[in-house]
């Protein structure tokens, strides 16, 4: 059967299945090394 | 059922340069974000880049280690995402997979970057 | 970059046995639409990585109900209730709420 998640930021359809925030956020700090 | 299939992986050269490819099936491919992640016995899994939507203008992000160097893109009338990569480095060494998300791998292309 | 902190390295389990495996982030994984981004990944050896749970506690299809997936915030914990010797491999938390998305070290699950 065809998957038809959407993962697209422009999208109506649910980001959830992807596993990813619709417009992930830059993270704040740096890991070391 | 959904498929992935990576290839392209091989020996290359320090500063040496490689394309992969994956082609995807069993998925409407272009409503996906598609992604490359590798995985390496020094760093474990790592994101490297991620393609996204002609919706969202096929927005791009890369991890910093491969920025200016490594370039992802799409082709959605075959289905298919590229990783140009060049300048190759020892630390790109890995098994290099294709992904929608987390949701869906493919079985992975091993790179191999030593002189 | 937000670090993922997976305890414990190995988990030796007797068939039948419960298992937890804890993943720590350091940056709190909400997002602003409510949702938790954390998902869960089982590499069996030789194998690319399958997804089993998503967003903190969904089971993907096909997975059985023995995962359970709980978590808020920063604090993650995947258990298996009763370990089958197909559970062996080693288990990786990633976060999809952050760029760059990132990977927990991996446990890795043993059968005693």
């Known amino acids: 059967s065809e998957t038809t998640t959407g993962t697209s930021s422009n999208s109506s359809q649910s980001t959830s299945n992807s596993g990813l925030a619709p417009n992930p956020t830059n993270a704040t700090t740096k890991a070391a090394g | 059922e959904v498929n992935l299939e990576e290839s392209g992986g091989g020996l290359v050269q320090p500063g040496g340069s490689r394309q992969l490819s994956c082609v995807a099936s069993?998925?409407?491919?272009?409503?996906?974000?598609m992604n490359w992640v590798r995985q390496s016995p020094d760093k474990g899994l790592e994101w490297v880049a991620q393609?996204?939507?002609?919706?969202?203008?096929?927005?791009?992000r890369y991890v910093d280690s491969v920025k200016g160097r490594f370039t992802i893109s799409r082709d959605d009338s075959e289905n298919t995402v590229y990783l140009q990569m060049n300048n190759l480095r020892a630390e790109d060494t890995g098994i290099y997979y294709c992904?929608?998300?987390?949701?869906?791998w493919g079985q992975g292309t091993t790179l191999t970057v030593s002189s | 970059d937000v670090v993922m902190t997976q305890t414990p390295l190995t988990l030796s389990v007797t068939i039948g046995q419960p298992a937890s495996i804890s993943c720590r982030s350091s940056?709190?994984?909400?997002?602003?639409?409510?949702?938790?981004?954390l998902n869960w990944l089982l590499q069996r050896p030789g194998q690319s990585p399958k997804r089993l749970i998503y967003v903190v506690s969904n089971l993907d299809s096909g997975v059985p109900d023995r995962f359970i997936g709980s978590g808020s915030g920063t604090d993650f914990t995947l258990k298996i209730s009763r370990v089958e010797a197909e559970d062996l491999g080693v288990y990786y938390c990633?976060?999809?709420?952050?760029?760059?998305?990132?990977f927990g070290g991996g446990t890795k699950l043993e059968i005693k």
């Open positions: 992904t929608t998300g987390t949701d869906y």
């Open positions: 393609i996204q939507l002609k919706s969202d203008n096929y927005a791009i």
């Open positions: 940056q709190s994984l909400l997002y602003s639409n409510g949702k938790t981004y």
């Open positions: 069993g998925l409407t491919f272009s409503k996906h974000w």
């Open positions: 990633v976060q999809g709420t952050h760029f760059p998305y990132t």
